[in-house]
Protein backbone atom coordinates (compact mmCIF):
# COMPACT_ATOMS: atom_id res chain seq x y z
CA UNK A 1 0.00 0.00 0.00
CA UNK A 2 1.55 3.24 -1.07
CA UNK A 3 1.07 6.55 -2.75
CA UNK A 4 1.92 6.45 -6.57
CA UNK A 5 2.10 10.60 -7.32
CA UNK A 6 2.49 10.07 -10.95
CA UNK A 7 6.06 8.64 -10.96
CA UNK A 8 6.53 10.01 -7.39
CA UNK A 9 6.14 6.56 -4.89
CA UNK A 10 5.53 7.23 -1.43
CA UNK A 11 5.60 4.23 1.14
CA UNK A 12 5.34 4.11 4.99
CA UNK A 13 2.33 6.57 5.39
CA UNK A 14 -0.78 5.06 6.59
CA UNK A 15 -3.34 7.06 5.80
CA UNK A 16 -5.50 5.68 8.53
CA UNK A 17 -3.39 7.57 11.33
CA UNK A 18 -3.66 10.66 9.05
CA UNK A 19 -7.25 10.79 9.21
CA UNK A 20 -7.16 9.73 13.13
CA UNK A 21 -5.19 12.78 13.68
CA UNK A 22 -7.10 14.84 11.79
CA UNK A 23 -10.71 13.96 13.52
CA UNK A 24 -9.26 14.39 16.80
CA UNK A 25 -9.00 18.32 16.35
CA UNK A 26 -11.59 18.70 13.46
CA UNK A 27 -14.43 19.77 15.38
CA UNK A 28 -12.05 22.73 17.30
CA UNK A 29 -10.53 23.64 13.65
CA UNK A 30 -13.98 23.66 11.66
CA UNK A 31 -15.45 25.47 15.00
CA UNK A 32 -12.60 28.07 15.02
CA UNK A 33 -13.19 28.71 11.16
CA UNK A 34 -16.11 31.52 10.99
CA UNK A 35 -15.12 32.53 7.27
CA UNK A 36 -17.49 29.66 5.93
CA UNK A 37 -17.85 31.47 2.23
CA UNK A 38 -14.41 31.07 1.14
CA UNK A 39 -12.18 27.74 0.87
CA UNK A 40 -8.16 27.78 0.12
CA UNK A 41 -8.46 23.99 -1.64
CA UNK A 42 -10.76 25.83 -4.03
CA UNK A 43 -12.02 23.62 -7.16
CA UNK A 44 -9.44 24.87 -9.35
CA UNK A 45 -6.71 23.73 -7.12
CA UNK A 46 -7.86 19.89 -6.71
CA UNK A 47 -10.07 19.58 -9.85
CA UNK A 48 -8.56 17.18 -13.01
CA UNK A 49 -4.64 17.10 -11.88
CA UNK A 50 -3.02 14.81 -13.83
CA UNK A 51 -1.02 12.28 -12.75
CA UNK A 52 2.69 14.45 -13.85
CA UNK A 53 1.12 17.43 -12.36
CA UNK A 54 0.35 15.75 -9.18
CA UNK A 55 3.90 15.00 -7.56
CA UNK A 56 4.69 18.86 -8.04
CA UNK A 57 1.38 19.88 -6.65
CA UNK A 58 1.67 17.36 -3.22
CA UNK A 59 4.87 18.49 -3.00
CA UNK A 60 4.60 22.35 -2.96
CA UNK A 61 0.99 21.89 -1.05
CA UNK A 62 2.66 19.97 2.11
CA UNK A 63 5.85 21.92 2.16
CA UNK A 64 3.34 24.86 2.56
CA UNK A 65 1.29 22.91 5.19
CA UNK A 66 4.82 22.44 6.99
CA UNK A 67 6.60 25.69 6.49
CA UNK A 68 3.60 27.93 6.95
CA UNK A 69 0.73 26.29 8.64
CA UNK A 70 1.79 24.14 11.29
CA UNK A 71 5.01 25.95 12.53
CA UNK A 72 2.98 28.85 13.35
CA UNK A 73 -0.03 26.96 14.66
CA UNK A 74 2.52 25.36 16.65
CA UNK A 75 3.13 28.06 17.95
CA UNK A 76 -0.26 29.41 19.14
CA UNK A 77 -1.66 26.32 20.98
CA UNK A 78 -0.91 25.14 23.92
CA UNK A 79 -3.38 22.09 24.53
CA UNK A 80 -1.56 18.89 24.33
CA UNK A 81 -4.20 16.94 22.13
CA UNK A 82 -4.14 19.04 19.24
CA UNK A 83 0.10 19.47 19.47
CA UNK A 84 -0.18 15.56 19.28
CA UNK A 85 -2.50 15.17 15.92
CA UNK A 86 -0.79 17.86 13.95
CA UNK A 87 2.93 16.60 15.34
CA UNK A 88 1.00 13.24 13.79
CA UNK A 89 0.51 14.99 10.46
CA UNK A 90 3.28 17.16 10.55
CA UNK A 91 5.40 14.11 10.98
CA UNK A 92 3.57 12.12 8.15
CA UNK A 93 3.79 14.88 5.79
CA UNK A 94 7.74 15.44 6.24
CA UNK A 95 8.15 11.28 5.24
CA UNK A 96 5.98 12.38 2.37
CA UNK A 97 7.86 15.22 1.17
CA UNK A 98 11.05 13.50 1.79
CA UNK A 99 10.14 11.07 -0.87
CA UNK A 100 8.87 13.12 -3.64
CA UNK A 101 11.35 13.95 -5.66
CA UNK A 102 9.64 16.02 -8.54
CA UNK A 103 11.38 15.47 -12.07
CA UNK A 104 13.10 19.29 -13.04
CA UNK A 105 13.78 18.54 -16.49
CA UNK A 106 13.13 21.17 -19.19
CA UNK A 107 10.85 19.31 -20.98
CA UNK A 108 8.34 19.14 -17.67
CA UNK A 109 8.18 22.87 -17.48
CA UNK A 110 4.68 22.74 -18.70
CA UNK A 111 3.45 20.63 -16.28
CA UNK A 112 5.83 22.16 -13.74
CA UNK A 113 3.73 25.16 -14.02
CA UNK A 114 0.30 24.19 -14.30
CA UNK A 115 1.14 23.07 -10.88
CA UNK A 116 2.72 25.85 -9.85
CA UNK A 117 -0.23 28.16 -10.85
CA UNK A 118 -2.59 25.70 -8.75
CA UNK A 119 -0.51 26.54 -5.90
CA UNK A 120 -0.75 29.84 -6.78
CA UNK A 121 -4.50 29.66 -6.40
CA UNK A 122 -4.66 28.17 -3.30
CA UNK A 123 -1.32 30.49 -1.11
CA UNK A 124 -3.68 33.80 -2.58
CA UNK A 125 -6.33 32.68 -1.09
CA UNK A 126 -4.41 31.89 2.28
CA UNK A 127 -2.96 35.50 2.06
CA UNK A 128 -6.19 37.28 1.54
CA UNK A 129 -7.44 36.09 5.07
CA UNK A 130 -5.29 37.48 8.32
CA UNK A 131 -3.32 35.10 9.75
CA UNK A 132 -4.58 33.50 12.54
CA UNK A 133 -8.35 33.00 10.21
CA UNK A 134 -6.29 31.57 7.34
CA UNK A 135 -4.15 29.02 9.72
CA UNK A 136 -7.37 28.04 11.16
CA UNK A 137 -9.12 27.40 7.80
CA UNK A 138 -5.99 25.85 6.36
CA UNK A 139 -6.15 23.09 9.43
CA UNK A 140 -9.76 22.56 8.88
CA UNK A 141 -9.12 21.61 5.26
CA UNK A 142 -6.64 18.88 5.96
CA UNK A 143 -9.63 16.71 5.53
CA UNK A 144 -10.09 18.33 1.22
CA UNK A 145 -6.33 17.39 1.41
CA UNK A 146 -6.57 13.94 2.22
CA UNK A 147 -9.73 13.09 0.10
CA UNK A 148 -8.26 14.31 -2.72
CA UNK A 149 -4.52 12.55 -2.34
CA UNK A 150 -6.50 9.48 -1.86
CA UNK A 151 -6.82 9.26 -5.27
CA UNK A 152 -2.98 8.35 -5.69
CA UNK A 153 -3.72 5.97 -3.09
CA UNK A 154 -2.67 2.28 -4.19
CA UNK A 155 -4.04 -0.72 -2.81
CA UNK B 1 -6.91 -14.90 4.96
CA UNK B 2 -8.87 -11.87 5.32
CA UNK B 3 -12.22 -12.40 6.83
CA UNK B 4 -15.17 -10.32 8.23
CA UNK B 5 -17.91 -12.27 10.13
CA UNK B 6 -21.57 -10.66 10.79
CA UNK B 7 -23.86 -11.96 13.35
CA UNK B 8 -26.30 -10.80 15.33
CA UNK B 9 -29.49 -10.39 12.61
CA UNK B 10 -32.59 -11.36 14.07
CA UNK B 11 -36.91 -10.62 13.64
CA UNK B 12 -37.57 -8.08 16.24
CA UNK B 13 -40.80 -5.85 16.79
CA UNK B 14 -40.18 -2.10 16.20
CA UNK B 15 -39.08 0.28 19.22
CA UNK B 16 -37.02 -2.75 20.16
CA UNK B 17 -32.76 -3.40 20.49
CA UNK B 18 -30.68 -5.81 18.62
CA UNK B 19 -26.64 -5.61 18.68
CA UNK B 20 -24.81 -6.78 15.52
CA UNK B 21 -20.95 -8.08 15.30
CA UNK B 22 -18.51 -8.41 12.95
CA UNK B 23 -15.58 -10.80 13.87
CA UNK B 24 -12.51 -9.85 11.83
CA UNK B 25 -9.27 -11.83 10.94
CA UNK B 26 -6.57 -12.11 8.84
CA UNK B 27 -5.37 -8.49 9.18
CA UNK B 28 -4.66 -5.89 11.90
CA UNK B 29 -7.68 -5.05 12.77
CA UNK B 30 -6.86 -2.21 14.98
CA UNK B 31 -4.80 -0.50 11.78
CA UNK B 32 -8.36 0.27 9.91
CA UNK B 33 -11.63 2.17 10.11
CA UNK B 34 -14.23 0.10 9.69
CA UNK B 35 -18.10 0.52 8.53
CA UNK B 36 -21.88 -0.93 8.43
CA UNK B 37 -23.39 -0.39 5.19
CA UNK B 38 -26.82 -1.69 5.16
CA UNK B 39 -29.24 -2.52 1.95
CA UNK B 40 -33.27 -2.59 2.30
CA UNK B 41 -35.02 -5.36 0.35
CA UNK B 42 -35.05 -4.46 -3.19
CA UNK B 43 -32.82 -1.41 -2.74
CA UNK B 44 -29.64 0.32 -2.89
CA UNK B 45 -26.58 0.34 -0.58
CA UNK B 46 -26.61 2.93 2.49
CA UNK B 47 -23.64 3.62 4.91
CA UNK B 48 -24.30 3.77 8.03
CA UNK B 49 -21.89 4.28 10.18
CA UNK B 50 -17.74 4.70 10.64
CA UNK B 51 -15.45 4.10 13.14
CA UNK B 52 -11.26 4.42 13.51
CA UNK B 53 -9.23 2.48 14.11
CA UNK B 54 -8.00 3.82 17.26
CA UNK B 55 -12.17 3.53 17.90
CA UNK B 56 -12.03 7.48 19.07
CA UNK B 57 -14.17 9.04 16.12
CA UNK B 58 -17.40 7.58 15.05
CA UNK B 59 -19.49 8.91 12.28
CA UNK B 60 -23.34 8.49 11.24
CA UNK B 61 -25.70 8.49 8.72
CA UNK B 62 -28.85 10.96 9.47
CA UNK B 63 -31.28 8.15 9.26
CA UNK B 64 -29.33 6.46 12.14
CA UNK B 65 -28.01 9.32 14.46
CA UNK B 66 -29.08 8.98 18.14
CA UNK B 67 -30.44 5.01 17.59
CA UNK B 68 -27.84 3.55 16.59
CA UNK B 69 -23.78 3.26 18.27
CA UNK B 70 -21.03 1.92 16.47
CA UNK B 71 -17.81 0.60 18.81
CA UNK B 72 -15.36 -1.81 18.71
CA UNK B 73 -12.90 -4.51 20.74
CA UNK B 74 -9.82 -4.00 19.45
CA UNK B 75 -8.60 -6.87 21.68
CA UNK B 76 -11.14 -9.51 20.27
CA UNK B 77 -11.13 -8.19 16.81
CA UNK B 78 -14.44 -7.26 16.61
CA UNK B 79 -16.72 -4.31 15.49
CA UNK B 80 -20.22 -3.73 16.92
CA UNK B 81 -23.42 -2.13 16.12
CA UNK B 82 -26.14 -1.48 18.70
CA UNK B 83 -29.79 -0.66 17.19
CA UNK B 84 -32.11 0.75 19.88
CA UNK B 85 -35.42 2.42 18.73
CA UNK B 86 -35.85 0.06 16.15
CA UNK B 87 -38.37 1.09 12.87
CA UNK B 88 -39.46 -0.98 9.81
CA UNK B 89 -37.20 1.15 7.25
CA UNK B 90 -33.99 -0.16 9.55
CA UNK B 91 -35.08 -3.73 7.71
CA UNK B 92 -32.04 -4.53 5.72
CA UNK B 93 -28.97 -6.64 4.84
CA UNK B 94 -26.41 -5.38 7.32
CA UNK B 95 -22.72 -5.49 5.71
CA UNK B 96 -19.39 -4.79 7.82
CA UNK B 97 -16.97 -3.72 5.80
CA UNK B 98 -12.87 -2.75 6.14
CA UNK B 99 -11.69 0.59 4.95
CA UNK B 100 -8.41 0.51 3.64
CA UNK B 101 -7.99 4.44 3.42
CA UNK B 102 -9.70 5.43 6.30
CA UNK B 103 -12.28 7.61 4.76
CA UNK B 104 -14.37 5.17 2.79
CA UNK B 105 -12.30 2.84 0.49
CA UNK B 106 -13.70 -0.24 1.06
CA UNK B 107 -12.27 -3.47 0.00
CA UNK B 108 -13.39 -6.09 1.61
CA UNK B 109 -17.10 -6.97 3.03
CA UNK B 110 -18.61 -9.39 5.33
CA UNK B 111 -21.85 -11.57 3.84
CA UNK B 112 -24.26 -9.68 5.90
CA UNK B 113 -26.37 -10.72 8.23
CA UNK B 114 -30.46 -10.08 7.91
CA UNK B 115 -32.88 -7.43 10.30
CA UNK B 116 -36.13 -7.64 10.22
CA UNK B 117 -38.00 -5.14 11.84
CA UNK B 118 -41.97 -6.33 12.34
CA UNK B 119 -44.58 -6.90 14.57
CA UNK C 1 -25.61 16.40 2.39
CA UNK C 2 -23.99 15.42 -0.87
CA UNK C 3 -25.80 12.95 -3.61
CA UNK C 4 -24.75 10.53 -6.17
CA UNK C 5 -27.12 10.22 -9.06
CA UNK C 6 -26.48 7.25 -11.28
CA UNK C 7 -29.92 6.04 -14.21
CA UNK C 8 -31.34 3.06 -12.72
CA UNK C 9 -30.62 0.40 -15.78
CA UNK C 10 -27.90 0.45 -18.89
CA UNK C 11 -28.10 -2.14 -21.31
CA UNK C 12 -25.27 -3.59 -23.54
CA UNK C 13 -24.68 -5.83 -26.13
CA UNK C 14 -22.43 -9.17 -25.06
CA UNK C 15 -19.06 -8.39 -25.99
CA UNK C 16 -20.00 -4.36 -26.54
CA UNK C 17 -18.95 -1.65 -24.42
CA UNK C 18 -20.90 -0.57 -21.47
CA UNK C 19 -20.64 3.17 -19.58
CA UNK C 20 -22.19 3.68 -16.46
CA UNK C 21 -22.44 7.24 -15.55
CA UNK C 22 -22.25 8.80 -11.65
CA UNK C 23 -23.26 12.30 -11.11
CA UNK C 24 -22.23 14.71 -7.81
CA UNK C 25 -20.90 18.06 -7.67
CA UNK C 26 -17.61 18.50 -8.22
CA UNK C 27 -17.12 14.79 -8.07
CA UNK C 28 -13.71 15.23 -9.87
CA UNK C 29 -11.41 16.50 -6.69
CA UNK C 30 -13.38 13.58 -4.93
CA UNK C 31 -12.50 9.55 -4.95
CA UNK C 32 -14.51 7.83 -6.32
CA UNK C 33 -15.15 3.90 -5.83
CA UNK C 34 -17.00 1.37 -7.92
CA UNK C 35 -18.64 -1.73 -6.28
CA UNK C 36 -20.19 -4.42 -7.79
CA UNK C 37 -23.17 -6.88 -6.24
CA UNK C 38 -24.73 -9.69 -7.43
CA UNK C 39 -27.76 -11.14 -6.50
CA UNK C 40 -27.62 -12.51 -2.97
CA UNK C 41 -24.04 -11.65 -2.70
CA UNK C 42 -22.00 -9.03 -1.09
CA UNK C 43 -20.67 -5.79 -2.79
CA UNK C 44 -17.19 -6.27 -4.84
CA UNK C 45 -14.85 -3.35 -5.29
CA UNK C 46 -13.92 -3.46 -9.06
CA UNK C 47 -12.74 0.14 -9.28
CA UNK C 48 -10.80 2.70 -6.51
CA UNK C 49 -9.92 6.21 -6.40
CA UNK C 50 -11.18 7.12 -9.78
CA UNK C 51 -9.31 4.48 -12.35
CA UNK C 52 -7.45 2.05 -10.59
CA UNK C 53 -8.19 -1.78 -10.45
CA UNK C 54 -7.92 -4.22 -7.62
CA UNK C 55 -5.97 -7.57 -7.82
CA UNK C 56 -8.25 -10.26 -9.42
CA UNK C 57 -10.42 -7.34 -11.19
CA UNK C 58 -10.58 -7.95 -14.99
CA UNK C 59 -9.00 -5.52 -17.16
CA UNK C 60 -11.60 -4.47 -19.18
CA UNK C 61 -12.91 -2.44 -16.27
CA UNK C 62 -12.11 0.77 -16.09
CA UNK C 63 -12.78 4.27 -14.38
CA UNK C 64 -12.87 7.97 -15.17
CA UNK C 65 -13.69 10.88 -12.38
CA UNK C 66 -13.22 14.46 -14.26
CA UNK C 67 -15.89 17.43 -13.12
CA UNK C 68 -19.15 16.26 -12.67
CA UNK C 69 -19.20 12.71 -13.40
CA UNK C 70 -17.62 9.63 -12.79
CA UNK C 71 -17.68 6.77 -15.20
CA UNK C 72 -17.20 3.55 -14.52
CA UNK C 73 -16.52 1.51 -18.29
CA UNK C 74 -16.57 -2.07 -19.16
CA UNK C 75 -14.98 -2.83 -22.47
CA UNK C 76 -16.46 -5.80 -23.97
CA UNK C 77 -18.85 -6.62 -21.50
CA UNK C 78 -19.28 -10.68 -20.57
CA UNK C 79 -22.43 -12.20 -19.47
CA UNK C 80 -20.99 -12.55 -15.66
CA UNK C 81 -20.98 -8.68 -15.74
CA UNK C 82 -24.12 -8.35 -15.31
CA UNK C 83 -25.06 -7.02 -11.93
CA UNK C 84 -25.71 -4.07 -9.76
CA UNK C 85 -23.31 -0.98 -10.18
CA UNK C 86 -22.56 1.67 -6.96
CA UNK C 87 -20.38 4.27 -7.31
CA UNK C 88 -18.99 6.19 -4.09
CA UNK C 89 -17.41 8.68 -2.53
CA UNK C 90 -15.85 10.27 0.79
CA UNK C 91 -18.10 13.64 1.57
CA UNK C 92 -17.59 15.45 5.50
CA UNK C 93 -16.98 12.26 7.39
CA UNK C 94 -19.39 10.26 5.38
CA UNK C 95 -19.49 8.30 2.87
CA UNK C 96 -21.97 8.17 -0.08
CA UNK C 97 -23.37 5.78 -2.29
CA UNK C 98 -25.15 6.47 -5.54
CA UNK C 99 -28.32 4.70 -6.31
CA UNK C 100 -26.93 1.81 -8.31
CA UNK C 101 -27.66 1.21 -11.65
CA UNK C 102 -28.49 -2.21 -13.24
CA UNK C 103 -26.88 -3.55 -16.37
CA UNK C 104 -28.33 -5.78 -18.54
CA UNK C 105 -25.95 -7.77 -21.04
CA UNK C 106 -27.76 -8.97 -23.98
Known amino acids: QEFHFGPCQVKGVVPQKLWEAFWAVKDTMQAQDNITSARLLQQEVLQNVSDAESCYLVHTLLEFYLKTVFKNYHNRTVEVRTLKSFSTLANNFVLIVSQLQPSQENEMFSIRDSAHRRFLLFRRAFKQLDVEAALTKALGEVDILLTWMQKFYKL | ELQLVESGGALVQPGGSLRLSCAAS????????MSWVRQAPGKGLEWVSH????????FYAESVKGRFTISRDNAKNTLYLQMNSLKSEDTAVYYC????????????WGQGTQVTISS | SYELTQSPSVSVALRQTAKITCGGDNIGSKSAQWYQQKPGQAPVLVIY???RRPSGIPGRFSGSNSGNTATLTISGAQAEDEADYYC?????????FGGGTHLTVL
Open chain 2, 26 to 33: GFTFDDYA
Open chain 3, 88 to 96: QVWDVSAAV
Open chain 2, 51 to 58: ISGNGRST
Open chain 2, 97 to 108: AKDDYGSGLYAY
Open chain 3, 49 to 51: ADS
